[in-house]
Interface confidence: low
């Protein structure tokens, strides 16, 4: 996976929460759910109440990047989605409050959010060639593309 040392001088400042309590569904219409206390997985749900609800916080880059940089938090918690390495599960990091400034190695908390029509992609800021992805019989992880699914639909107002 790509090293992120070249990003270490870029500073990201928290602006505001831009979305509350939304659900992420992958291209197979599987929703992201809590696999257990520390990771996420994807499953086809009859009842969307079981899906994880996320909040999305926006950050502004000191580099004046055109990309939208976001943090993903599980709604009503202090758990934040954290990237590891390629094919490793994304983790849930417990923090007392949303970080006001993120730089260096802490960029594993941040994702570039890109939209193409109804498709949403979340690229890791720490590993810019890797996406949040679902994978059959596996946790939600970071992946470069197929066979993992990297595009998501955002379902809002599910609260």
């Amino acid at each position: 996976s790509a090293p992120f040392s070249f990003l270490s001088n870029v500073k990201y400042n928290f602006m505001r929460i831009i979305k509350y309590e939304f659900i992420l569904n992958d291209a197979l219409n599987q929703s992201i759910i809590r696999a257990n206390d520390q990771y996420l997985t994807a499953a086809a749900l009859h009842n969307l109440d079981e899906a994880v609800k996320f909040d999305m916080g926006a950050y502004k880059s000191s580099k004046d990047d055109a990309k939208i940089t976001v943090i993903l938090r599980i709604s009503k918690t202090q758990l934040y989605v954290t990237a590891q390495d390629e094919d490793q599960p994304v983790l849930l990091k417990e923090m007392p409050e949303i970080p006001k400034t993120i730089t260096g190695s802490e960029t594993n908390l941040l994702f570039f959010w890109e939209t193409h029509g109804t498709k949403n992609y979340f690229t890791s800021v720490a590993h810019p060639n890797l996406f949040i992805a679902t994978k059959q019989d596996y946790w939600v992880c970071l992946a470069g593309g197929p066979p993992s699914i990297t595009d998501f639909q955002i379902l809002e107002n599910q609260a």
Partner: antibody, heavy 122, light 106 residues
Framework: QIQLVQSGPELKKPGETVKISCKAS????????MNWVKQAPGKDLKRMAW????????TYADDFKGRFAFSLETSASTAYLQINNLKNEDTATYFC???????????????WGQGTSVTVSS | IQMTQTTSSLSASLGDRVTISCRAS??????LNWYQQKPDGTVKLLIY???RLHSGVPSRFSGSGSGTDYSLTISNLEQEDIATYFC?????????FGGGTKLEIN
């Protein structure tokens, strides 16, 4: 069944170091975070820290930064609490407790160790 | 968020219905747990999310409440229920506990 078994009582002098263990069984250790909770004589229960059993990363409560270290031996499904430079006010019972989020957002500690008594006295 | 159990000790007779209360300093949206600590020190989760019984907990235990005020009820007190009961909020770090209510037999 799920069990957390802690090491036995400790009697230490001020300035010494103590290391307490908590061995988990009956579930997949890396799937659940582990808490350490302090109960000083006649005082409330106080959550000291939460340790991510996948990465080993700890989140400390404000009162427990500095002399306290939390570690794991994942292959043995064991968590450790180490207190350095012991002080009299460290005299307490220390519990490990498995963490779980119910309904995605409500945190509880669903299984507890039996507690380890640490007495610090000169 | 601070948790307050105003009654530090409570005396009751076997077979009694006993209610223990707990108050949060702000709304905790039902993220309230109850724990039992026996005289030998062992701690067990009894109730999570205000009213849900943890596995293996007898049905004589129940929980209720909302907003900032919560309670634990034991409908038919038994000898084995002699213990200290702690509430804990599970909404916001550091997930504070109440001071405990010690239940004794008359």
């Amino acid at each position: 069944q799920i069990q957390l078994v802690q090491s036995g009582p400790e009697l230490k002098k001020p300035g010494e170091t103590v290391k307490i263990s908590c061995k988990a069984s009956g579930y997949t250790f890396r799937n659940y975070g582990m808490n350490w909770v302090k109960q000083a004589p006649g005082k409330d229960l106080k959550r000291m820290a939460w340790i991510n059993t996948y990465t080993g990363e700890s989140t400390y409560a404000d009162d427990f930064k500095g002399r306290f270290a939390f570690s794991l031996e994942t292959s043995a499904s064991t968590a450790y609490l180490q207190i350095n430079n012991l002080k009299n006010e460290d005299t307490a019972t220390y519990f490990c407790a498995r963490g779980i989020y119910y309904y995605g957002s409500s945190y509880a500690m669903d299984y507890w160790g039996q507690g380890t008594s640490v007495t610090v006295s000169s | 968020i601070q948790m307050t159990q105003t009654t530090s000790s409570l005396s009751a007779s076997l077979g009694d219905r006993v209610t223990i209360s707990c108050r949060a300093s702000q709304d905790i949206s039902n993220c309230l747990n109850w724990y039992q600590q026996k005289p030998d020190g062992t701690v067990k989760l009894l109730i999570y999310y205000t009213s849900r019984l943890h596995s293996g907990v007898p049905s004589r235990f129940s929980g209720s409440g909302s907003g900032t005020d919560y309670s634990l009820t034991i409908s038919n007190l038994e000898q084995e229920d002699i213990a200290t009961y702690f509430c804990q909020q599970g909404k916001t770090l550091p997930y504070a506990f109440g001071g405990g209510t010690k239940l004794e037999i008359n």
